[in-house]
C-alpha cells in the first residue's frame, strides 16, 4: 500500500510568493513559494495519486507583516483552503500567548493540530481540551494512518506559552501515544513534529512503532541528487535512521519558508512495515503557476497589510541614528534600540534564580540600513522600520562559549575604519577596544550582564562559560565573516521577524529616546 506524504515546515507566514532567498518578492518571474503556488502542486499530486496526506510540522506563525496584522487568522484560513490533513504545533505558534493560538488557529482550523508532549494544567486544561490532540487517526483510501505530534520542549525559552502548559520530553511523551495507536490496530504511524533534525532522528531511533518522522524547527534541507536551488543538503532525502529495534525509519524535513514541498512516497506492507521510501522536496519555482482562486484570495487579504504599514506604531523624541557613518564605526542609538528590543522580546522568567534566561545581544552594524528622523512629528511606522531592517531576517537565540564571543568581537574590529558591516552593536555587553593594537588582539575589556542574579550587573566574560545571545539569523549563519559563530555555536533556535520585534517594542514603549551610553568604547 503506497502513501504519498506532502509536507511543509517553518513556513513563517510566507503566504505570498518570495524571492529565492525567501525575502519579499521583487521580480515575479523569478519568485517562489506562496500558498497559491503550493496549492497548484498539491492539487496536481492529489489528482495523480490515490493516497495523499498534506502535513505541516509547525511554525506557520511569525515571519512577515501577514502575521503581525492577522495574528494567525491567515494561517487557519489558507491552511483550510489548501485542505491540510494535520499540523504539529511549533514553538512560534505560542508567540502571542496561548490565547493567540486558541482563538485564531485552534478554534478555526478544520484539520487536527497535534502535540503529544504539551500537557495543559490548571484553568487552561478545560479551556484548551480537545482543541489540540496528542494524535489523530486519519482514513487514507482503504487504510488508516496514525499521526502523533510533538513540539520542542525548549518552547518556554523561545516563545510565550505561559505557565499552564508543560512541555515534556518528546520521546517519553510519544511512546505511550504510539503504544495506544498500536492497541487500536493502527500499524502505520507518522511522527509529525517541531523539535529539530537531531530530535527527529532520535525519535526515529527510540520510539518503537514510529514508521516515518516528518520534522521541522531546524530548517533542514535534505535532497537526493543535484539540488535545484541554493540550499545545500544536510543529507539524503529521506534520511534513513536505523531504529533500536532494527527497522529503517525515513526522516524528512523540507527546509523552510514554503520554498519547497516535501514529497515522500512510502510503500507499506500489511503489517505496517515500511518496505520502501523515496522522494525529494519539490522546488516551488515560477514554472508552477499560482492557483488563480487562492491568488485572488491572497490579493483580497493583502489590502489590510498595505494600510497597516503606514499607521503609527509609536513615537521617537530623538533622532534614531542608523547611518552607516555611525553604526559601522561606533555605538549608535539605533543599534541600542534594536538590541534593547531584541532582549525585551526574549524576556522569559522561567526560573527564580535568573532574572532572565538571556541578557546579551549582538547586531552587525551593516544590518542597519537607514536612520529614522524624529522631525516627522516623531512618528514611526512599519514602513520606516522596513527601511531600517529590509532583509526580512529573524532575531535568533544561540548558545556560544565565551571564547567564541571574544573571537566575534575581535572580528568586529579586525579591519576597523573601512566602513564594513561586521562592526557589532550590542546590548547587555560593555566592550572596550584598543585600535592601536594589531587585529585579533584589540578587545581589551569585555564585560557581560549577568542572568543568574536579582540585580543585573556587568561581569568579565569567562572564556569557558556558555552564554545565551540574541542575534540576527544572518550572524548565526556566519554572515559578515562571523564564521566562528556558525562553526562554534552550541545551539541555535530561530526567533521572531526582525521588524516585528522592533515594532512590538516601540508599540509597547509608546515613546522612545534611546541614547549612546558607553556600551562600546
Amino acid at each position: 500500500w503506497e502513501l504519498t506524504i506532502l509536507h511543509t515546515n517553518d513556513v513563517h507566514s510566507r503566504l505570498e510568493q518570495t524571492s529565492e532567498d525567501s525575502s519579499k518578492c521583487v521580480n515575479a518571474s523569478r519568485c517562489m513559494g506562496g500558498v497559491a503556488r503550493l496549492f497548484t502542486k498539491v492539487q496536481q499530486i492529489r489528482r495523480a495519486e490515490p493516497n495523499v496526506l498534506l502535513l505541516d510540522a509547525g511554525d506557520q506563525y511569525q515571519g512577515t507583516i501577514w502575521f503581525t496584522v492577522y495574528k494567525g487568522a491567515e494561517v487557519a484560513h489558507f491552511m483550510n483552503a489548501l485542505r491540510y490533513d494535520a499540523m504539529a504545533l511549533g514553538n512560534h505558534e505560542f508567540d502571542n500567548g496561548v490565547e493567540g493560538l486558541i482563538e485564531p488557529l485552534l478554534k478555526e482550523a478544520k484539520f487536527p493540530i497535534l502535540s503529544a508532549n504539551i500537557k495543559a494544567k490548571g484553568p487552561l486544561a478545560s479551556q484548551i481540551s480537545g482543541l489540540y490532540l496528542p494524535y489523530k487517526v486519519l482514513p487514507v483510501g482503504d487504510e488508516v494512518v496514525g499521526i502523533v505530534g510533538y513540539t520542542s520542549k525548549e518552547t518556554p525559552f523561545l516563545s510565550n506559552p505561559g505557565t499552564n502548559l508543560v512541555f515534556e520530553d518528546e520521546i517519553t511523551a510519544l511512546q505511550p501515544e504510539v503504544d495506544k495507536l498500536k492497541t487500536l490496530n493502527v500499524n502505520k504511524i507518522i511522527a509529525l513534529g517541531h523539535s529539530g533534525f537531531e530530535m527527529d532522528k532520535l525519535i526515529a531511533q527510540k520510539v518503537r512503532g514510529v514508521d516515518v518522522v516528518v520534522g521541522g524547527h531546524s530548517n533542514t534541507f535534505l535532497y537526493t541528487g543535484n539540488p535545484p536551488s541554493k540550499e545545500v543538503p544536510a543529507g539524503k532525502y529521506p534520511f534513513i535512521v536505523t531504529s533500536d529495534d532494527g527497522r529503517k525509519v525515513p526522516v524528512v524535513q523540507a527546509y523552510a519558508f514554503g520554498k519547497y514541498l516535501g514529497y515522500l512516497k512510502i510503500e507499506f506492507d500489511e503489517r505496517g512495515n515500511v518496505i520502501s521510501s523515496h522522494g525529494n522536496p519539490i522546488l516551488l519555482n515560477s514554472s508552477i503557476p499560482e492557483d488563480p482562486s487562492i491568488k485572488a484570495d491572497i490579493n483580497k487579504w493583502r489590502i489590510k497589510l498595505d494600510n497597516y504599514s503606514t499607521q503609527e506604531l509609536g513615537k521617537t523624541i530623538v533622532y534614531l541614528d542608523g547611518s552607516s557613518q555611525s553604526c559601522r564605526f561606533r555605538e549608535c542609538n539605533m543599534g541600542n534600540l534594536i538590541c534593547d528590543a531584541m532582549i525585551n522580546n526574549n524576556l522569559r522568567h522561567t526560573d527564580e534564580m535568573f532574572w532572565n534566561h538571556v541578557s546579551m545581544c549582538i547586531l552587525n552594524g551593516g544590518g542597519i540600513r537607514s536612520p529614522i528622523d524624529e522631525r516627522n512629528n516623531g512618528t514611526i511606522t512599519w514602513e520606516n522600520l522596513a527601511a531600517v531592517l529590509p532583509f526580512g531576517g529573524t532575531f535568533d537565540l544561540v548558545q556560544l562559549k565565551g571564547s567564541t564571543l571574544k573571537k566575534a568581537f575581535e572580528h568586529s574590529v579586525h579591519r576597523y575604519g573601512q566602513s564594513t558591516g561586521e562592526f557589532l552593536q550590542v546590548g547587555g555587553i560593555h566592550v572596550v577596544y584598543d585600535l592601536s593594537r594589531k587585529p585579533g588582539d584589540r578587545v581589551v575589556k569585555l564585560d557581560v550582564l549577568c542572568t543568574k542574579c536579582r540585580v543585573p550587573s556587568y561581569d568579565p566574560l569567562k572564556m569557558d562559560e556558555v552564554y545565551k545571545v540574541i542575534l540576527p539569523n544572518f550572524l548565526a549563519n556566519g554572515g559578515d565573516g562571523f564564521q566562528m559563530i556558525k562553526d562554534e555555536l552550541l545551539r541555535h533556535d530561530s526567533g521572531d521577524q526582525d521588524i516585528n520585534v522592533v515594532s512590538t517594542y516601540i508599540s509597547k514603549m509608546k515613546v522612545i529616546y534611546p541614547a549612546v551610553e558607553g556600551r562600546i568604547k
Epitope: 536505523t242 503489517r271 515500511v274
Partner: antibody, heavy 114, light 107 residues
Framework: EVQLVQSGAEVKKPGASVKVSCKAS????????MNWVMQAPGQGLEWMGR????????FYSQKFKGRVTMTVDKSTSTVYMELSSLRSEDTAVYYC???????WGQGTTVTVSS | DIQMTQSPSSLSASVGDRVTITCRAS??????LNWLQQKPGGALKRLIY???SLDSGVPSRFSGSGSGSDYTLTISSLQPEDFATYYC?????????FGGGTKVEIK
C-alpha cells in the same frame, strides 16, 4: 494479526486443473496484493505471480503464463490460484504470501499423478 | 530476469557460531531484498525486509546488510532453533526471484 488460510491437499491427474484458495484476515484486504509461490519436493522456492486485491490486476511469471489464473473474491477476502494442463512436474507445495511475503499460508500440497 | 546466486548452498555450524550467507543479484536491486527462513516442517517466515529491517519478533542476532547487487544475512550467534534453510528474495523487478537457498545444519 495477519492470517492466511489455504485450502486442503489435492491429487490431480495430468492434464487436469487445480484451484487453490487462500483466505486472508487481519488487515485491510483491498489495499494490498497476494503472491503465489511454488516449492517442488526437495527444491527451492519459485515465484509464480501476484494479484492486486482491489481491481484484480495480475502479473504472472513467464514460466506459468498461459496456465495460471489468479482471481480474487473481495466479499470473502479470498484469493484463488488455478493451474491448468497439469503435469507431473507441477507436483509441489503452493503457498500464498502477502504483498512483500511478510506472512505466508500454511501451504497446499498438489500431487499430479496418473 | 534477475538471477539470485546464493552461497553457500549448505553449511555446518555449531551453536554460538557466527554464520554469514550471501546473495548476489545479476544486476542492481537497490535494497529490494528480503531474507526468509524455512524450518524442516515447511513453515516460511520472513526475517529481514528491505535489506536490513528486522521483522517484529525476530531476534536481534539476525541482521541484514548490502547494497547494489551484493547482500548478506548474518546470524551473530547461532542458536539451536536457527537450524533451517534460508532464502533471499529480490522484489526490485518482475518476475520476483529467489536465491537457491542455504541449508544450515548442525556440525
Amino acid at each position: 494479526e495477519v492470517q492466511l488460510v489455504q485450502s486442503g491437499a489435492e491429487v490431480k491427474k495430468p492434464g487436469a486443473s487445480v484451484k487453490v484458495s487462500c483466505k486472508a484476515s487481519g488487515y485491510t484486504f483491498t489495499a494490498y496484493f497476494m503472491n503465489w509461490v511454488m516449492q517442488a519436493p526437495g527444491q527451492g522456492l519459485e515465484w509464480m505471480g501476484r494479484i492486486y486485491h482491489n481491481n484484480g490486476d495480475t502479473f504472472y511469471s513467464q514460466k506459468f503464463k498461459g496456465r495460471v489464473t489468479m482471481t480474487v473474491d473481495k466479499s470473502t477476502s479470498t484469493v484463488y490460484m488455478e493451474l491448468s494442463s497439469l503435469r507431473s512436474e507441477d507436483t509441489a507445495v503452493y503457498y500464498c504470501a502477502t504483498s512483500y511475503v511478510g506472512d505466508w499460508g500454511q501451504g497446499t500440497t498438489v500431487t499430479v499423478s496418473s | 530476469d534477475i538471477q539470485m546466486t546464493q552461497s553457500p548452498s549448505s553449511l555446518s555450524a555449531s551453536v554460538g557460531d557466527r554464520v554469514t550467507i550471501t546473495c548476489r543479484a545479476s544486476q542492481d536491486i537497490g535494497d529490494s531484498l528480503n531474507w526468509l527462513q524455512q524450518k524442516p516442517g515447511g513453515a516460511l517466515k520472513r526475517l529481514i525486509y528491505a535489506t536490513s529491517s528486522l521483522d517484529s519478533g525476530v531476534p536481534s542476532r539476525f541482521s541484514g546488510s548490502g547494497s547494489g547487487s551484493d547482500y548478506t544475512l548474518t546470524i551473530s550467534s547461532l542458536q539451536p532453533e536457527d537450524f533451517a534453510t534460508y532464502y533471499c528474495l529480490q522484489y526490485a523487478s518482475f518476475p520476483w526471484t529467489f536465491g537457491g537457498g542455504t541449508k544450515v545444519e548442525i556440525k
